[in-house]
Amino acid sequence: AGTPPGKAFNLTWISTDFKTILEWQPKPTNYTYTVQISDRSRNWKYKCTGTTDTECDLTDEIVKDVNWTYEARVLSYPAGNVESTGSAGEPLYENSPEFTPYLETNLGQPTIQSFEQVGTKVNVTVEDERTLVRRNNTFLSLRDVFGKDLIYTLYYWKSSSSGKKTAKTNTNEFLIDVDKGENYCFSVQAVIPSRTVNRKSTDSPVECMGQEKGEFRE
């Protein structure tokens, strides 16, 4: 037996740096969707009521506690009748997989904020991206959320050579040794060591000395 007409399927969490959207299929015809997400009291909260979209932004809910394991479901109603039910007296619905933001949100592509050379040392700073996770009415950065559980790996190489080197930090700054008079290029990657999946981000865009972001001091 296939999926009944109107019932959602392929429910998928799409989440990067805690910005979290639930997606599903199919595109509706003559019916609408309503999403419910279970809160920490295991109550179902309504979101995206009566939508004809196949996605629902649940960021506002999951950022309340990023360590909580959430479950959502997509309810299907015939168009114009939010009270319509299936044969069992309930609307057709499909459950999502469980989702724990802290463990599962993808790490977004990091950005090198700046680099500064002083003699034979270069300080490379990674932008501490703001997330939508709040504490005391302020938005937390990625570092605020993950603390020492977030590592950045730096790849760097002389512009004139292909041999790369690497360094790591559990802050957002690197201090590396360079050869005087040489230009270097840099790229960073974020890692959550404690994870077993979704551990690494994509590499940041490459930034090279002699371009805008750098500063040089003798």
């Epitope: 790996t153 080197k165 690497t166 590396i176 551990r199």
Partner: antibody, heavy 117, light 107 residues
């Protein structure tokens, strides 16, 4: 469970090449950094280099750069070490290891390589 | 490149003794230092990571301390099964470097 199994070692003549493999199971190599480390008979551990299998980034100890090449086949969940222009001093047990970014948490059993005429 | 100087290269101690091994880095390695135990014919086994953190399943008689360039590994009460060679590894920047190793024997 997580396992790393090296293969491809053996006896080879100086100047020849050898390709070692490290088959991973219980995890996807693309989620981790992967390393090769070697140990000559009666000597200490020596780091060769690493790869990020997801993007192909490789880093080597300069003494191995150009002569040794690390690669990965994500579809086969396997790491490789291509060793060219082998010398007697390359005789060692070669280990692959998984890196969680704070430590090497799993190692293979090692595969011995002997370079001799 | 960062050099790791490990000492002593060998030491002999009695069961129950407190044993200390040191590793000195040629520059600040910001606690990116691990300690491994290796027994003959076996792969290294992680004991301590990030200079001071005990790896899962490792007995509490093993400990690590230090920061900057100076690091210490301690076995508080030596057991017969601790006979092995011990290595430090810095992984703060490439090339990663191991100490020369300390061969531990029981008198």
């Amino acid at each position: 469970q997580v396992q790393l199994v090296e293969s491809g070692g053996g006896v080879v003549q100086p100047g020849r090449s050898l390709r070692l493999s490290c088959k991973a199971s219980g995890f996807n190599i693309k989620d981790y950094y992967m390393h090769w480390v070697r140990q000559a008979p009666g000597k200490g551990l020596e780091w060769i280099g690493l790869i990020d299998p997801e993007n192909g980034n490789t880093i080597y100890d300069p003494k191995f750069q150009g002569r040794f090449t690390i690669s990965a086949d994500n579809s086969k969940n396997t790491l490789f070490l291509q060793m060219d222009s082998l010398r007697p001093e390359d005789t060692a047990v070669y280990y692959c290891a998984r890196d969680n970014s704070y430590y090497f948490d799993y190692w293979g059993q090692g595969t011995p390589v002997t370079v001799s005429s | 490149d960062i050099q790791m100087t490990q000492s002593p290269s060998s030491l002999s101690a009695s069961v129950g003794d407190r044993v200390t091994i040191t590793c000195k880095a040629s520059q600040d390695i910001r606690k990116y230092l691990n300690w491994y135990q290796q027994k003959p014919g076996k792969a290294p086994k992680l004991l301590i990571y990030y200079a001071t953190s005990l790896a899962d399943g490792v007995p509490s008689r093993f400990s690590g301390s230090g920061s900057g360039t100076d690091y210490t590994f301690t076995i508080s009460s030596l057991q017969p099964e601790d006979i092995a060679t011990y290595y430090c590894l810095q992984h703060g920047e490439s090339p990663y470097t191991f100490g020369q190793g300390t061969k531990l024997e029981i008198t």
